[in-house]
């Protein structure tokens, strides 16, 4: 139709100019379209340069839209992580503050002479919570062994207790149970509580990290062509008012985001495991009850030691021999009053319940994030036609879009009519992130069963380091030796230093 050949390019000029491009590129009227590489080659208002500019722009716009969606999800996960992390650290800090405030009055020098040992225990618990590769059971065993040695000396100032005698005491300790049931109870409960807390917070961190890394995955050239065709070819072909057909848009974005959709199964598994582990936040072995009450177990232990002092001393003498009396030493330490115990069960503050219910709701909301991404971007960013009718842009002209909508994921794109996807070449960054999701899900499942797991770095290259049982020194066989280990980067932030008298303490 000769009349159509001289159609004005005014509308295209407006749109093109609004994008910040030079208006001098736009022809006054339609020209023949043999030069077009992406759009159908009918009469057109687009030069080669315009097509290239618009293709680059459509690519950038899709990447921006993708990043925006990811940023919203990342921000939600980061906020959750910060809230839970603050709460858990607050519980532990609160417990330590309570200990520092009450133990001097309750236990006198039995505490003040050993303040450093208690301070270190809290430091190690903090590190353990943050994901450091510490063995909690060994850390606790070593704490009790050292504390016993020091308290035994304090309770018997009238005795000469050389190192070899104290070493003998240490070897007897496990059988003597000098601190009663407190160490065993604390070990069992703390391991479960801390591993639940730290794996949950780390799960949030891994999820956020995966979103961040996947958002940086570039869209391929085939996707760029398809998005240009979807978004701007209608303008070039003189039907700027035609909006993309919904199914057409979905097929383009399902092809473009095929690899991202493959995250779906493991993403769901991770979020399910995170929701599940929040069950471990309640009850007598729950996070709130245990982490906030470490000091009460410690008080119970010191009380038990004082109550059992005479029996303990008799058993130690039986196993290690009679120690020499210190001629200059004072008489035996008189029994101190029992340290008053705060109730072990902390009344729930309500904060954690609120945090958990919000988190569960938000995690459920984003469970289908990856597979709903094409639909979300199409409906929110692509100005779709409201109906799948014959007036929408189908990639060639105004008209009905006939092909069926593809399934989700890479394998389902084999016959995608809009994007040529090589299903034999999955994106390696995304495969690595799938692996990170699997690893974290396994950690959460172990944590749910109360098992301590060696947290390895969720490193960029997807590789991790195994842990062997090699020994660095001759103390490995000792019950209380600490496993030589390197602590990992903290998940969030280091605690500010505390100052102690003249000594300036830093972290």
């Amino acid at each position: 139709d000769p009349a159509s050949k001289s159609r004005s390019c005014g509308e295209v000029r407006q749109i093109y100019g609004a994008k910040g491009f030079s208006l001098s590129d736009v022809p006054q009227a339609e020209i023949s379209g043999e030069h077009l590489r992406i759009c159908p080659q009918g009469y057109t208002c687009c030069t080669s340069e315009m097509e290239e500019n618009l293709a680059n722009r459509s690519h950038a716009e899709l990447e921006t839209a993708l990043r925006d969606s990811s940023r919203v999800l990342q921000a939600m996960l980061a906020t959750q992580l910060r809230s839970f992390d603050d709460h858990f650290q607050h519980l532990l800090n609160d417990s330590e503050r309570t200990l520092q405030a009450t133990f001097p009055g309750a236990f006198g020098e039995l505490y003040t002479q050993n303040a450093r040992a208690f301070r270190d225990l809290y430091s190690e618990l903090r590190l353990y919570y943050r994901g450091a590769n510490l063995h909690l059971e060994e850390t606790l065993a070593e704490f009790w062994a050292r504390l016993l040695e020091r308290l035994f000396k304090q309770l018997h100032p009238q005795l000469l207790l050389p190192d070899d005698y104290l070493d003998c005491l240490g070897k007897q300790a496990e059988a003597l149970r000098p601190f009663g049931e407190a160490p065993r109870e604390l070990r069992l409960r703390a391991t479960r509580a801390f591993v639940a807390a730290r794996s949950f917070v780390q799960g949030l961190g891994v999820a956020s990290d995966v979103v961040r890394k996947v958002a940086q995955v570039p869209l391929g050239p085939e996707c760029s062509r398809a998005v240009m065709k979807l978004v701007y070819c209608a303008h070039c072909l003189g039907v700027p008012g035609a909006r993309p057909c919904p199914d057409y848009c979905r097929n383009v974005l399902k092809g473009c985001l095929a690899n991202q959709a493959d995250l779906d199964a493991e993403w769901r598994n991770l979020l399910d495991s995170m929701v599940l582990i929040t069950d471990k936040f309640w009850g007598t072995s729950g996070v709130e009850s245990v982490i906030g009450s470490v000091h009460t177990w410690l008080a119970e232990a010191i009380n038990a030691l004082q109550d059992n002092r005479d029996t303990l001393t008799a058993k130690v003498i039986q196993g290690c021999g009679n120690p020499k009396v210190n001629p200059q030493g004072p008489g035996p330490e008189e029994k101190r009053r029992r340290g008053k115990l705060a109730p072990r069960e902390r009344p729930p503050s309500g904060t954690l319940e609120k945090l958990v219910s919000e988190a569960k709701a938000q995690l459920r909301d984003v469970q289908d994030f990856w597979i709903s991404l094409p639909g979300t971007l199409c409906s929110e960013k692509m100005a779709l036609s409201t109906a799948s009718d014959d007036r929408c842009w189908n990639g060639m002209a105004r008209g009905r879009y006939l092909p069926e909508v593809m399934g989700d994921g890479l394998a389902n794109q084999i016959n995608n009519p809009e994007v040529e996807v090589d299903i034999t070449k999955p994106d390696m960054t995304i495969r690595q992130q799938i692996m990170q999701l699997k690893i974290m899900t396994n950690r959460l499942r172990s944590a749910y069963n109360g098992n301590d797991v060696d947290f390895q770095d969720a490193s960029d290259d997807g590789s991790g380091s195994g842990s062997g049982d090699g020994c660095l020194d001759d103390l490995c066989s000792r019950k209380v030796s600490r496993k030589s280990s390197s602590s990992r980067t903290p998940l969030t932030h280091a605690l500010p230093g505390l100052s102690e008298q003249e000594g300036q303490k830093t972290s």
């Epitope: 002479q113 103390l475 280990s485 003249e502």
Partner: antibody, heavy 118, light 108 residues
Framework: EVQLQQSGPELVKPGASVKISCKAS????????IHWVKQSPEKSLEWIGE????????TYNQKFKAKATLTVDKSSSTAYMQLKSLTSDDSAVYYC???????????WGQGTLVTVSS | SIVMTQTPALMAASPGEKVTITCSVS???????LHWYQQKSETSPKPWIY???NLASGVPVRFSGSGSGTSYSLTISSMEAEDAATYYC?????????FGAGTKLEIK
């Protein structure tokens, strides 16, 4: 057998910095604090500070806070002390020492002589 | 900070003689936090007596320690040539940890 092996003597110019090392062996490095002590003819023995290799917690003697920086490398079981802005007052023998159980210096390195001279 | 004052700064004793070195502490400390170290020239200090009165491994029984509060002492019941050295007291009660200035013990 517990051993603390310190780096060799250092001759440094005023204003410069020096980093001395203390390699631990024969025990679990992360299990015990490492302390640093200065010995000069004028001032006898002076405690500089301590570091907990497990947690990285450090306590300094306020007097040495601006002078010394303590660090550890757990992978090599080595403690380090960096001394900065050196003057002739910093010429001394520096010892690392390991405590036994929060209570005394049970093991000492052989010492590192630092001489500050132009 | 806690100041440790040792007396005498220098002394000489004949073999077989009884020797006492004292360490005065500027504020009262627990006896478990007072330690003594021996140092011979060109070598590192060695733990000698810990917790006021416990002898470190390998220390001859002629050495003993006593005291409480602010006043502590190290005693050699019968001086021998190998005991010639400098002895330092040290407190582990509060930061900063502090040492005495040392007592140099020589053999006559």
């Amino acid at each position: 057998e517990v051993q603390l092996q310190q780096s060799g003597p250092e001759l440094v110019k005023p204003g410069a910095s020096v980093k001395i090392s203390c390699k631990a062996s024969g025990y679990s490095f992360t299990g015990y604090y490492i302390h640093w002590v200065k010995q000069s003819p004028e001032k006898s023995l002076e405690w500089i500070g301590e570091i907990n290799p497990s947690t990285g917690d450090i306590t300094y003697n306020q007097k040495f806070k601006a002078k010394a920086t303590l660090t550890v490398d757990k992978s090599s079981s080595t403690a380090y002390m960096q001394l900065k802005s050196l003057t002739s007052d910093d010429s001394a023998v520096y010892y690392c020492a390991r405590e036994r159980n929060y209570d005394r210096f049970a093991y000492w390195g052989q010492g590192t002589l630092v001489t500050v001279s132009s | 900070s806690i100041v440790m004052t040792q007396t005498p700064a220098l002394m000489a004793a004949s073999p077989g003689e009884k020797v006492t070195i004292t360490c005065s502490v500027s504020s009262s400390i627990s006896s478990s936090n007072l330690h003594w170290y021996q140092q011979k020239s060109e070598t590192s200090p060695k733990p000698w007596i810990y917790g006021t009165s416990n002898l470190a491994s390998g220390v001859p029984v002629r050495f003993s320690g006593s005291g409480s509060g602010t006043s502590y002492s190290l005693t050699i019941s019968s001086m021998e040539a190998e005991d010639a050295a400098t002895y330092y007291c040290q407190q582990w009660s509060s930061y900063p940890l502090t040492f005495g200035a040392g007592t140099k013990l020589e053999i006559k």
